[in-house]
Interface confidence: low
């Protein structure tokens, strides 16, 4: 008769964790003639057919069920046993849920911490930016995003086996030019005949693509670069100036900055 009451027995203490070495034995109650060999499903290089022992080195997270057979002239198969391998969360990633397109300053933004699987499934989430913990939910929400929120974000998913981090995800915030100011070189008081350079400084993403300069009468000047060079500077150039910066998001303007051009000693002497 074939071997009777064949069972596959896991020798390891439970739970089994990914990476463990797992030993299984193929047991039976009686056999006539004697058992001469064993078979395993799935097959593997770790079998020792004559001993009825299966050793799985570095068990994978997806190892599910194993079954053995004890054979004399016939083979009797045991019911499969589930290894029930436990493992840290897998395939963790940051996913932008909203908005669907690029992120503009003031948008409501939601980031989701996704993972493909975890065993056990009870997990905790952690969000961090530049090493600073931001939250412990599966989502990270910004009611009104600001340029200061831009940066590199990561999420972590923990279970009792371990923790897995996502790749860093870069959050880019687009915003209209802001913090505009007109700086003057060599200073805001220049002697006539010298040169004066006015620079429109700003903070914008994407960078400013177009500048417009205005004088104290709000007249636009025929200059569209970041720097406005007056050379030679004349007393008539004295007055307040401001600039406007434009990018694909919008426009921003600077406050007024006053340039004072004073007469040279020669001019004063002639008078």
């Amino acid at each position: 008769y074939p071997p009777k009451k064949v069972t596959t027995v896991i020798q390891n203490p439970m739970p089994i964790r990914e990476g463990d070495t797992v030993t299984l034995s193929c047991n039976y109650n009686s056999s006539n003639p004697s058992v001469t060999r064993y078979e395993w499903k799935p097959h593997g290089a770790w079998e020792e057919p004559s001993l009825g022992v299966l050793k799985i080195q570095n068990v994978g997270w997806d190892n599910t069920t194993i079954a053995c057979a004890a054979c004399n002239s016939w083979c009797s198969w045991a019911s499969p046993v589930a290894l029930n391998v436990q493992y840290a969360p897998r395939d963790v990633r940051v996913r932008k849920i909203k908005p669907l397109s690029e992120i503009h300053s003031g948008n409501s933004v939601s980031l989701q911490c996704d993972f493909s699987s975890s065993h056990p499934k009870e997990v905790q989430f952690f969000w961090e930016k530049n090493g600073r913990l931001l939250g412990k939910e599966s989502q990270l929400n910004f009611d009104s995003i600001s340029p200061e929120d831009a940066g590199s974000y990561s999420c972590w998913v923990n279970n009792s086996i371990g923790q897995t981090a996502s790749k860093a995800w870069t959050l880019e915030v687009l915003y209209a030019p802001r913090r505009l100011r007109v700086s003057m070189s060599p200073g805001d008081q220049v002697m006539e005949g010298k040169s004066a350079t006015l620079t429109c400084e700003s903070d914008a993403n994407p960078p400013v693509s177009h500048y417009t300069w205005f004088d104290w009468n709000n007249q636009s000047l025929p200059y569209h670069s970041q720097k406005l060079r007056l050379e030679p500077v004349k007393v008539q150039h004295s007055g307040a100036y401001w600039c406007q910066g434009t990018n694909s998001v919008g426009k921003g303007r600077s406050p007024l900055s006053t340039l004072t051009v004073y007469y040279s000693p020669e001019t004063i002497g002639r008078r």
């Epitope: 996913r95 849920i97 909203k98 669907l100 939601s110 989701q112 996704d114 493909s116 699987s117 499934k121 939910e137 599966s138 989502q139």
Partner: antibody, heavy 117, light 108 residues
Framework: EVQLVQSGGGVVRPGGSLRLPCAAS????????MSWVRQAPGKGLEWVSG????????GYADSVKGRFTISRDNAKNSLYLQMNSLRAEDTALYHC??????????WGQGTMVTVSS | RIVMTQSPGTLSVSPGETATLSCRAS??????LAWYQQKSGQPPRLLIY???TRAAGVPARFSGSGSGTEFTLTISNLQSEDFAVYYC??????????FGQGTKVERK
């Protein structure tokens, strides 16, 4: 056997409501996101709505936003689509599918919703 | 919204030949692209996910490739059971998954 069993379709008047259930079996339901996909007669597939594993995140196609609500009851292994303010253009075969945030590997057999006066 | 455009609308192929189906996205996205097969009166069946990974039980004659905005499904040595409608789908832009309009593969 891994399967999604659907019920609850039927004929409804424009402006009416209908709730579609989808019962999951053979897999750990709360391991997976779920979605609804519809197919109008003779037309292609249109993703309608999705929900993540614990219901904390949902999404809708523009065509149904504000009218349809997706939900799930993990204790009952069930997914639902509440459809309000139905229109003639909502007439379609509605499939539930496993995969709210991934490819859809398991599909329900579909349930027909006809919106007609 | 990412728009998926499939071509051709209909492809006439003889059994044993190779069918090449194209799917173009309106904007680049990560590798979250799937292909489905649908036969008349049946729900769709997942063939390929992650651009090129075959789903369980899918024969090796089905292969996926591509990146960025251009993706391809190739069916080599076409069998009679492969005549069906095929859809591509992007599932990277949660929660705005979109399908292509479909390509019908018919017998020549």
């Amino acid at each position: 056997e891994v399967q999604l069993v659907q019920s609850g379709g039927g004929v409804v008047r424009p402006g009416g409501s209908l709730r579609l259930p989808c019962a999951a079996s053979g897999f750990t339901f709360d391991d997976y996101g779920m979605s609804w996909v519809r197919q109008a007669p003779g037309k292609g597939l249109e993703w309608v709505s999705g929900i993540n594993w614990n219901g904390g995140s949902t999404g809708y196609a523009d065509s149904v936003k504000g009218r349809f609500t997706i939900s799930r009851d993990n204790a009952k292994n069930s997914l639902y689509l509440q459809m309000n303010s139905l229109r003639a253009e909502d007439t379609a075969l509605y499939h539930c599918a496993r995969g709210g945030d991934d490819a859809f590997d398991i599909w329900g057999q579909g349930t027909m919703v006809t919106v007609s006066s | 919204r990412i728009v998926m455009t499939q071509s051709p609308g209909t492809l006439s192929v003889s059994p044993g030949e190779t069918a090449t189906l194209s799917c173009r996205a309106s904007q680049s996205f990560s590798n979250m692209l799937a292909w489905y097969q649908q036969k008349s009166g049946q729900p769709p069946r997942l063939l390929i996910y992650g651009v090129s990974t075959r789903a369980a039980g899918v024969p090796a004659r089905f292969s996926g490739s591509g990146s960025g905005t251009e993706f391809t499904l190739t069916i080599s040595n076409l069998q009679s059971e492969d005549f069906a409608v095929y859809y591509c789908q992007q599932y990277g832009d949660w929660p705005r998954y979109t399908f292509g309009q479909g390509t019908k593969v018919e017998r020549k």
